[in-house]
Structure formats: structure tokens, C-alpha cells
Interface confidence: medium
């Protein structure tokens, strides 16, 4: 075995925006530190066969399979994949090791399989086997976290049944409103599953894995806060756990909290209380109402009452499956070129939606904001006054929703012209859709006022580019106009644009643009 080469097999993962991958260099730039695939001699195989650890790759990821050979002299090599031979160009690194690389750009199903590398050195021949498969992210899940009470302790456990195992963190904030935004200095994060400090203003639990991040807020009624004008509403699906926290602060301990569902006290075992003194010696009490697995009959008004505060209520609605309620009829808008305008969709949904805005096959991030009346709203303002079709798409675990918008920008026509031996055509994308006139320029009509009506064919809205209509007009050439200049004009309520075309010369035609406001 002394004469066997020392072989190292590595995997290099490239970040998707790594412009160096696939460049002409046979040694692409490394984006991340190489991962050792530990090439081991395969026992009981005829010949010398090394086997690398199996490689799992995400769809569309870019990787390099690399072999480092510590053997004297020159080497030659050949890659074989699915019975096809692939060129192989070894080179030597600074330590004088032979380096052989296989770059796989934007991994697809067709690129998965066994890659065989045959290497011939002065001393011996050997084979290296790589097995590349697509990581089955179909089995991946990321579920919204939920809460459980810790056995025999006043603490909450945050659970997210996700694959791969998620990192769970509590996101705590003790101030109000805007200052509780994710990156605010008022926000404290604790990367642990159990939380004992349950007196804070805003408590959320988040779970994250390769699929992203999902959070659940601990629904809270604060008797010291001015409530929303309308009753807050909490949706849950049958079988999910219900947790509502009621919080109150008073100058001393002489007050109590109670929960009622539809004017009936909650049963023992469906609530627990905690209290503490705050820094200014006032007493904070919290009372949790919880149901480990809700049924339809847990629907109703949950009211938290105090002997020293106004009571407050929340409406809990239990549904069989999630929903997205919104009007899906398409909407058309017509705006001026500099008018401020946003598309907006008002919806009610449970569980929370994931959404995108799409224009011209390009997706834009989607933000949603809760309104006072239990609805949410998503707005899109980044249209940059481009006319066309905009699509709002939303989905959650149980429902999908799509709404189409058309944006028309009021503007004067702009004319483009093209001509062939037999006809001249003009195109315009102004809005409202323009009307067309053709005029002949001659000695009799040097100002091109002689109207042409014969041989004109107008097509309104003949090409729909992502919802943007284009109007065209074609003039069939006749002997009467050959050799003359003709002018096509498009006009709408905002103005007129014209193009002048010379109709005699073969080859490229000179166009003279002429704008009239």
C-alpha cells in the first residue's frame, strides 16, 4: 500500500451570487471553507476505488467537487457521469499536489447522480466515486411555535415541530408600539426554549431553520393600557393550544384577576397566576388562560376582570381550517405620471399569510400591517410608475389567494416607426390608447396636412406586455405615396406625437420624430 497515493476529496459550496463560479479559470474562487468528504478505499472492489462521503445539495445551489492527489509525477484524468465522458484538466497547487475539480452550477435533478473520476498517475490507476443528490427539502417543515406550561413550574416552553430541528428564541420587549420593532434596542433575545420572566410587555417566540423564521406572539390583554376601540380577536384552529395573558399593575397587592368565558368562570386547571413587585414597588399580576387543545366550544368572549381596573375582553374564534378572506376581483387604476399611488389589499387571514407582489415576472417583498378592526393590509408603492399588470399572491397552510391589479399611466403617446418594402408601421404605448392619423408630405402639402385614409389599418392593443397595451397603425404602400415622406401621428387627451417616414429607399428608413404637445 506504500505506493498508493494520498488522496483528499473536498466539497466547496458556492454562494449563489458568487460570480466567480464557472468562469474560465479551472480553479473557481472558494466561497466557503471546503468540507472534507473523507475519501476512503472501498473494500472488496476490483481495482483501487476510493469513495467520497455522499453529497446533498440544495436545488439551484452551486458546488465544486475537488480531489487533491499527493502523488509523484504527472497525472491524467477523466470524469464520467451517466455514461458520458467529461473533460478533465488537472493542475498543481502550491504544495505540488494534483488538483482536479468538477463545477456543478445551479444544481438540478438532472445533475444528481454518480460522478466517477478516473485518475492515471505514473505509479498507478485508481477511481474516485462521488454520489451527489438533491437535498429533499420537501420533507422540510417550519411550523409556527406554540406554548406549553412547564410541568410544576411557572414558566412557558416554546415548541416548534419543524424539520430540521429549529433554533428557538424568545423575543422580549418592555416598551410600547414602534420601539418593539425587531431591531430596536428595547428588544432582548434569548436563545432558549423555556421562559421564566413572563411579566414583560411584549413576548414572542420565534423558531428558525433552513426554511426561514416563524414567530408567535403571546396574546396579551393589559388592563392598564387604553384598549383598542374594538374587541381584539384571536383565531385558532381546532386542536391548537390557546394562551391569553391578562396583565395588571396596581399600587399595592390588594387586587385580584379573574378570567370568564361568556360570563362563566374558567375551570380550575385552565388558568394560572403569577405576581411580582416592580422596581417602584407596585404590584404586577398576570393571569394566564389556557386550553391545551381547543375545540369549537372554546369559541367566545374571554373577559379578564380586576377589582381595581376596567375589565377587557377578547373574542376567540375557533375554525376548522385556516382561511384568507379578501375580495379577489381585479382592480384597474389610472394615474398621472407623477401621482403618488399605492396598491393595497385588505384581508383577514389565519394563520398569518406569506405574500408577494409580482410585476413583470419579478417578485417584490410584501409587508403586512394589522388594522384596528381585525383586518390586515398589504400595500405596494414601488411600481415606479410602470404601467402593467401587478399581482398580489398570499398563502398560508390552508389557503391561497391571488388578486390582479392593472396600472395605467396617463401620458402622451410616444411613437416608434418601422418600415418594409410594402408597408410602414407606427407603434405607441400612450394612455388613454391613442387614435391615429397618416399624412402625406408633398409639394402641394409641405406641412404634411394631406390626410391619407386609403390602406390604413389600425390595431388597438395588439401586444400585451405584462398588462401594458400597445397600439399600432400600419400603412400599406401604394404607388400614390411611394417616394414621399409620410407622417403618422398618435394623439390622445394628453397630446400628440408624430414620426415622419421616407417611403422610397430600400434598407433602413430614416425616421424623424416630431412631438407636438
Amino acid at each position: 500500500n506504500q505506493d498508493l497515493p494520498v488522496i483528499k476529496c473536498v466539497l466547496i459550496n458556492h454562494k449563489n451570487n458568487d460570480s466567480s463560479v464557472g468562469k474560465s479559470s479551472s480553479y473557481p474562487m472558494v466561497s466557503e471553507s471546503p468540507e472534507d468528504l473523507g475519501c476512503a478505499l472501498r473494500p472488496q472492489s476490483s481495482g483501487t476505488v476510493y469513495e467520497a462521503a455522499a453529497v446533498e445539495v440544495d436545488v439551484s445551489a452551486s458546488i465544486t467537487l475537488q480531489v487533491l492527489v499527493d502523488a509523484p509525477g504527472n497525472i491524467s484524468c477523466l470524469w464520467v457521469f451517466k455514461h458520458s465522458s467529461l473533460n478533465c484538466q488537472p493542475h498543481f497547487d502550491l504544495q505540488n499536489r494534483g488538483v482536479v475539480s468538477m463545477v456543478i452550477l445551479k444544481m438540478t435533478e438532472t445533475q444528481a447522480g454518480e460522478y466517477l473520476l478516473f485518475i492515471q498517475s505514473e505509479a498507478t490507476n485508481y477511481t474516485i466515486l462521488f454520489t451527489v443528490s438533491i437535498r429533499n427539502t420537501l420533507l422540510y417543515t417550519l411550523r409556527r411555535p406554540y406554548f406549553r406550561k412547564m410541568e410544576n413550574q411557572d414558566a412557558l416552553v416554546c415548541i416548534s415541530e419543524s424539520v430540521p430541528e429549529p433554533i428557538v428564541e424568545w423575543v422580549l420587549c418592555d416598551s410600547q408600539g414602534e420601539s418593539c420593532k425587531e431591531e430596536s434596542p428595547a428588544v432582548v433575545k434569548k436563545e432558549e426554549k423555556v421562559l421564566h420572566e413572563l411579566f414583560g410587555t411584549d413576548i414572542r417566540c420565534c423558531a428558525r431553520n433552513e426554511l426561514g423564521r416563524e414567530c408567535t406572539r403571546l396574546f396579551t390583554i393589559d388592563l392598564n393600557q387604553t384598549p383598542q376601540t374594538t374587541l381584539p380577536q384571536l383565531f385558532l384552529k381546532v386542536g391548537e393550544p390557546l394562551w391569553i395573558r391578562c396583565k395588571a399593575v396596581h399600587v399595592n397587592h390588594g387586587f385580584g384577576l379573574t378570567w370568564e368565558l361568556e360570563n362563566k368562570a374558567l375551570e380550575e386547571g385552565n388558568y394560572f397566576e403569577m405576581s411580582t413587585y416592580s422596581t417602584n414597588r407596585t404590584m404586577i399580576r398576570i393571569l394566564f388562560a389556557f386550553v391545551s387543545s381547543v375545540a369549537r366550544n372554546d369559541t367566545g368572549y374571554y373577559t379578564c376582570s380586576s377589582s381595581k381596573h376596567p375589565s377587557q375582553s377578547a373574542l376567540v374564534t375557533i375554525v376548522e381550517k385556516g382561511f384568507i378572506n379578501a375580495t379577489n376581483s381585479s382592480e384597474d387604476y389610472e394615474i398621472d405620471q407623477y401621482e403618488e399611488f399605492c396598491f393595497s389589499v385588505r384581508f383577514k387571514a389565519y394563520p398569518q399569510i406569506r405574500c408577494t407582489w409580482t410585476f413583470s415576472r419579478k417578485s417584490f417583498p410584501c409587508e403586512q400591517k394589522g388594522l384596528d378592526n381585525g383586518y390586515s393590509i398589504s400595500k405596494f408603492c414601488n411600481h415606479k410608475h410602470q404601467p402593467g399588470e401587478y399581482i398580489f399572491h398570499a398563502e398560508n397552510d390552508d389557503a391561497q389567494f391571488t388578486k390582479m391589479f392593472t396600472l395605467n399611466i396617463r401620458r402622451k403617446p410616444q411613437v416608434l416607426a418601422e418600415a418594409s418594402a410594402s408597408q410602414a408601421s407606427c407603434f405607441s404605448d400612450g394612455y388613454p390608447l391613442p387614435s391615429w392619423t397618416w399624412k402625406k408630405c408633398s409639394d402641394k402639402s409641405p406641412n404634411c396636412t394631406e390626410e391619407i385614409t386609403e390602406g390604413v389599418w389600425n390595431r388597438k392593443a395588439n401586444r400585451k406586455v405584462f398588462g401594458q397595451w400597445v397600439s399600432s397603425s400600419t400603412l400599406n404602400m401604394s404607388e400614390a405615396i411611394k417616394g414621399f415622406l409620410v407622417k403618422c401621428c398618435a394623439y390622445n387627451s394628453l397630446g400628440t406625437s408624430c414620426e415622419t417616414i421616407l417611403l422610397n429607399s430600400p434598407g433602413p428608413f430614416p425616421f424623424i420624430q416630431d412631438n407636438i404637445s
Epitope: T229, L231, S306, S311, N373, G374
Partner: antibody, heavy 121, light 112 residues
Framework: QVQLVQSGAEVKKPGASVKVSCKAS????????MHWVRQAPGQGLEWMGL????????SYARNFQGRVTMTRDTSTSTVYMELSSLRSEDTAVYYC??????????????WGQGTLVTVSS | DIVMTQSPLSLPVTPGEPASISCRSS???????????LDWYLQKPGQSPQLLIY???TLQSGVPDRFSGSGSGTDFTLKISRVEAEDVGVYYC?????????FGGGTKVEIK
């Protein structure tokens, strides 16, 4: 029975401040929100804001922000509404009104008798 | 802010006859919990306002059942089945969906 008794009529000069009181009785003072609503002569009703008597937290209408202050004294079950930088258009009857418990639905089940504030130079 | 518009401005009525007042809001007052956040108040001459109807159609206790409220979303109606002399005054609708709470301009009901 529930009663809301307001302080007497006031005459003030432009630029001055006025403080109107509303004394509650016949119910647990800290368990109901108190609102202030005003009515200019021959005009309709205009909501000014509310106070949570338990915590003292307030919510004011935008038109009055910066000029109105609502406070409470739990020992006397009284709420106060102070309006500063008075102008002639602040001449109105000012009402305190209680909103039902249950918390989030604001309906005015009891009203004070009203306090006429006249702003005149 | 939500704008409340009432009509008519003035309503002369005959005792024993029905009367109807309309109230329109600039945005829907229907909450996702199914309730319409609209109340009706009556202010009799020289008195403080009093609550008649809340949540668009629920009669406040102690209010005669000749008063009824209906409507949903943005259009609401207060009906008096048979007007009595004591019903004169100014009727106001009020939205309680969001702060600031806003009132309609009022409808003055008087005997013909």
C-alpha cells in the same frame, strides 16, 4: 345609582386655561373608562378623548393633542379635563361620559349634566 | 378619521306616525368579529345625550321598543315605529370602530 356630577359654568379669556371636573358615584370608579365630549352652541357632538381611571392612561383626539390634559383622583372618584390656550371657538358645553365595562367597546351609558365654558375677551 | 353623515338634517313628524333616520360612514364599521360598531344617541332639548342603540341594532336597557336600528357596513338606519311627543330632540349616530370616535351631524326630530 350611577351619577356623574360636573363642576359649574366658567367664563375665560382667550389664551387662558380651564379645568372642568366630573365626580363619579354609584359604581366602582376604577372599573369604567371616562370620556370627554363637547358641544359648541347649536352644533353637534365632538369626542375629545378618554382616561382609564385605574392607570391614568389617556387617549386624545388629534384636534386636541397638546392642548388637553385629562387626569383623575381615585381618592375622590373624580376626573378632570384641562384645556389650555383657549380661543373663542372653544366656547361649548363639555360633557363627561362613562363607557361600559368589558373594556374595548366604547358606548356611553351615563353622561354628566354638562359644563358650559365661555371664552370671551 | 371616519366621517359620519346623517340625513335628513331636520325631520318634522306626526305623533303616531313612523320615522326613519339614515347614517352613512366613510368606511365600513363591520368588525371581523361580526359586530357593526355604530351607536345611536338622543339629545332631548336642554338635556345630556342618552344611549338608545349600540352595535347597530341592540336596544339599550330601558329604551322603548318602538326604537330599532338596522344596517351593516357603511349604511345604517334608526327607525321609530310610532313617534311620541317625548321623542323630540336631536338624534346622533356615532362610530366606535376606531379612535377618534366620531359623531354624525345630527337629525332634529320635531312635531309637525
Amino acid at each position: 345609582q350611577v351619577q356623574l356630577v360636573q363642576s359649574g359654568a366658567e367664563v375665560k379669556k382667550p389664551g387662558a386655561s380651564v379645568k372642568v371636573s366630573c365626580k363619579a358615584s354609584g359604581y366602582t370608579f376604577t372599573s369604567y373608562y371616562m370620556h370627554w365630549v363637547r358641544q359648541a352652541p347649536g352644533q353637534g357632538l365632538e369626542w375629545m378623548g378618554l382616561i382609564n381611571p385605574s392607570s391614568g392612561s389617556t387617549s386624545y383626539a388629534r384636534n386636541f393633542q397638546g392642548r388637553v390634559t385629562m387626569t383623575r383622583d381615585t381618592s375622590t372618584s373624580t376626573v378632570y379635563m384641562e384645556l389650555s390656550s383657549l380661543r373663542s371657538e372653544d366656547t361649548a358645553v363639555y360633557y363627561c361620559a362613562r363607557s361600559g365595562s368589558g373594556g374595548s367597546y366604547f358606548l356611553f351609558d351615563y353622561w354628566g349634566q354638562g359644563t358650559l365654558v365661555t371664552v370671551s375677551s | 378619521d371616519i366621517v359620519m353623515t346623517q340625513s335628513p338634517l331636520s325631520l318634522p313628524v306626526t305623533p303616531g306616525e313612523p320615522a326613519s333616520i339614515s347614517c352613512r360612514s366613510s368606511q365600513s364599521l363591520l368588525h371581523s368579529n361580526g359586530y357593526n360598531y355604530l351607536d345611536w344617541y338622543l339629545q332631548k332639548p336642554g338635556q345630556s345625550p342618552q344611549l338608545l342603540i349600540y352595535a347597530a341594532s341592540t336596544l339599550q336597557s330601558g329604551v322603548p321598543d318602538r326604537f330599532s336600528g338596522s344596517g351593516s357596513g357603511t349604511d345604517f338606519t334608526l327607525k321609530i315605529s310610532r313617534v311620541e311627543a317625548e321623542d323630540v330632540g336631536v338624534y346622533y349616530c356615532m362610530q366606535a370602530l376606531q379612535t377618534p370616535l366620531t359623531f354624525g351631524g345630527g337629525t332634529k326630530v320635531e312635531i309637525k
